[in-house]
Interface confidence: low
């Protein structure tokens, strides 16, 4: 239904608090370098304007689109050219090109300082002094570092952030109460950001058909009792929500997500028996809960898939009549029967089925041609099963840190041109698949592991896209969304790589390493490991292990020394010399 004023419509639907929070997120995701105070000023101006439109929808400029209003507001920033360079050229464009231009300048790896957590008392004082500013600052800092963060979900995180401070700043031991909660929010937030980044990449790089296929498979696994028409309706609505959020239309996205949650809860009898608890919660919690809800039980009496999709004489007729509907039904029927498969595997199977029908429906005897199509699925299913089995065995044998190191070596040898920080970040995240998924029984391992790996490899793809250095990464990232993981798995050592020159500075360490947290110390060691492999890509596992063991002993020894800095300087030289000898550098 058309509204005279879109901004008034969204203000009334969302309420002032959510409206302001979402506009702040939108602005911070576009202008990631702007100071907090500047954004707050812009948001207040937009909010005041929205209120005039609520009072009189016919008032001047109230009929303008949100992109026009927000874009005009962003283009008033005085330092746009100095701070953002060519992004300022966006302001010379008209909508919708201007918004597309802003979207293209979103930076997945902005040059922003690491967020340092102040002392608990300092944070509690700031929280009590001005709760609203404190929470806005949280939204701002997360949004500018994660320009594709799912905005309505960020509101949910902010609500939990507020609850943590409200509870813990009154506790006897504030730190014991607060710090674990903040750690949990940080880790969940990073995971949420990465998952949403994959959804946006899927929509933006591979189109809505790819996203819809993913959604059909996932929702069919989650709601196996729902009819195909019901799943289709949810897929259409979910696609709209994510297209809006990925496109920077955060007010529409949040509004439509709320409508979708409302619809799901009003129709839970025909969707899933697992939604009852979610639907009793307030809006933000409800939407989050629905998004994470466990798979419903499969109907007991599902017939064989072969009847409709292989044995029927009408397969080609049905396919020709409406290809995407028929393939959608195939994906729905296969996915609801296989909660034990990853979504990407289900999509590979659907792609194989589609390719077979394209070929066979043009053949002299179509039925004869596609009769064995399900046999082609076997190797596709076994490949991730075997890979997960092998890697879980390795993880159980090594533990997380050493498993990450094994992956660091593996991936550095595959794509040594990629920057060291990216290789460390991605390999550490790949390594977390072990503790995340290997504990699960067989039936849950593949959906956990392979769909998680898709999220992590997408991080590699978006970081690499910003500064492309490897044709192999580009190829694996762009050829097929569902075959990214098999593509990377299949890469061997890059024989064309010219080893990096040895630089002693890279392997010079100082006493400051002793005061780092265990995690940060690991990252330092893993950074050194990547650099070692870049210098000596042909080094064996045994050689690398020996050097890393020596390195760990060196750090431990010097951190216990009275004169730490001297120890690092002198012992460090010896370590570098010994490592060069061991690796033949």
């Amino acid at each position: 239904d058309a509204h005279k004023s879109e901004v008034a419509h969204r203000f009334k639907d969302l309420g002032e608090e959510n409206f302001k929070a979402l506009v702040l997120i939108a602005f911070a995701q576009y202008l990631q370098q702007c100071p907090f105070e500047d954004h707050v000023k812009l948001v207040n101006e937009v909010t005041e304007f929205a209120k005039t439109c609520v009072a009189d929808e016919s008032a001047e400029n109230c009929d303008k689109s949100l992109h026009t209003l927000f874009g005009d507001k962003l283009c008033t920033v005085a330092t746009l050219r100095e701070t953002y360079g060519e992004m300022a050229d966006c302001c010379a464009k008209q909508e919708p090109e201007r918004n597309e231009c802003f979207l293209q300048h979103k930076d997945d790896n902005p040059n922003l300082p690491r967020l340092v957590r102040p002392e608990v008392d300092v944070m509690c004082t700031a929280f009590h002094d001005n709760e609203e500013t404190f929470l806005k600052k949280y939204l701002y800092e997360i949004a500018r570092r994660h320009p594709y963060f799912y905005a309505p979900e960020l509101l949910f995180f902010a609500k939990r952030y507020k609850a943590a401070f409200t509870e813990c700043c009154q506790a006897a031991d504030k730190a014991a109460c607060l710090l674990p909660k903040l750690d949990e929010l940080r880790d969940e937030g990073k995971a949420s950001s990465a998952k949403q980044r994959l959804k946006c990449a899927s929509l933006q790089k591979f189109g809505e058909r790819a996203f819809k296929a993913w959604a059909v498979a996932r929702l069919s696994q989650r709601f196996p009792k729902a009819e195909f028409a019901e799943v289709s309706k949810l897929v259409t609505d979910l696609t709209k929500v994510h297209t809006e959020c990925c496109h920077g239309d955060l007010l529409e996205c949040a509004d439509d997500r709320a409508d979708l949650a409302k619809y799901i809860c009003e129709n839970q009898d025909s969707i899933s028996s697992k939604l009852k608890e979610c639907c009793e919660k307030p809006l933000l919690e409800k939407s989050h809960c629905i998004a994470e809800v466990e798979n419903d039980e499969m109907p007991a009496d599902l017939p064989s898939l072969a009847a409709d999709f292989v044995e029927s004489k009408d397969v080609c007729k049905n396919y020709a009549e409406a290809k995407d509907v028929f393939l959608g039904m195939f994906l729905y029927e296969y996915a609801r029967r296989h909660p034990d498969y990853s979504v990407v595997l289900l999509l590979r199977l659907a792609k194989t089925y589609e390719t077979t029908l394209e070929k066979c429906c043009a053949a002299a005897d179509p039925h004869e041609c596609y009769a064995k199509v399900f046999d082609e699925f076997k190797p596709l299913v076994e490949e991730p099963q075997n890979l997960i089995k092998q890697n879980c065995e390795l993880f159980e044998q090594l533990g997380e840190y050493k498993f990450q190191n094994a992956l660091l070596v593996r991936y550095t040898k595959k794509v040594p041109q990629v920057s060291t920080p990216t290789l460390v970040e991605v390999s550490r995240n790949l390594g977390k698949v072990g503790s995340k998924c290997c504990k699960h029984p067989e039936a849950k391992r593949m959906p956990c592991a392979e769909d998680y790996l898709s999220v992590v490899l997408n991080q590699l793809c978006v970081l690499h896209e910003k500064t492309p250095v490897s044709d192999r990464v580009t190829k694996c990232c762009t050829e097929s969304l569902v075959n990214r993981r098999p593509c990377f798995s299949a890469l061997e050592v890059d024989e064309t790589y010219v080893p990096k020159e040895f630089n002693a500075e890279t392997f010079t360490f100082h006493a400051d390493i002793c005061t780092l947290s265990e995690k940060e110390r690991q990252i330092k060691k893993q950074t050194a490991l990547v650099e070692l492999v870049k210098h000596k890509p042909k080094a064996t596992k045994e050689q690398l292990k020996a050097v890393m063991d020596d390195f760990a002993a060196f750090v431990e020894k010097c951190c216990k020394a009275d004169d730490k800095e001297t120890c690092f300087a002198e012992e460090g030289k010896k370590l570098v010399a010994a490592s060069q000898a061991a690796l033949g550098l």
Partner: nanobody, 116 residues
Framework: EVQLVESGGGLVQEGGSLRLACAAS????????LGWYRQGPGNERELVAT???????SYADSVKGRFTISRDYDKNTLYLQMNSLRPEDTGLYYC??????????WGQGTQVTVSS
């Protein structure tokens, strides 16, 4: 409810050109196939041209080489460029969008008249 609105029809001399446009009132997320159809005086409605979401096109034999179907995804608009028009091309031209998850949509039609 999404509406389709055709425009660009009119009266043209034989051998002339017209460009029809079909605009959707809002973004349609589940397009499967887009097409132009026509209904000449006293005739059944017939297919003129189709385009898939992957931009594969197909044409009725009678218009091959003369008509070109295209779409502008960002503007939610379907086009039909008609060159070398003939009197037998006269009729009411409709656009249709077949959808994956919803019933198909038809426009209300735009009249094309080719005089000899």
């Amino acid at each position: 409810e999404v509406q389709l609105v055709e425009s660009g029809g009119g009266l043209v001399q034989e051998g002339g050109s017209l460009r029809l446009a079909c605009a959707a009132s809002e973004r349609i997320w589940d397009i499967n196939l887009l097409g132009w159809y026509r209904q000449g005086p006293g005739n059944e409605r017939e297919l003129v041209a189709t385009i898939t979401v992957g931009d594969s096109t197909s044409y009725a034999d009678s218009v091959k080489g003369r008509f070109t179907i295209s779409r502008d995804y960002d503007k939610n608009t379907l086009y039909l460029q008609m060159n070398s028009l003939r009197p037998e091309d006269t009729g009411l031209y409709y656009c249709k969008i077949r959808r994956t998850w919803h019933s198909e949509l038809w426009g209300q039609g735009t009249q094309v008249t080719v005089s000899s």
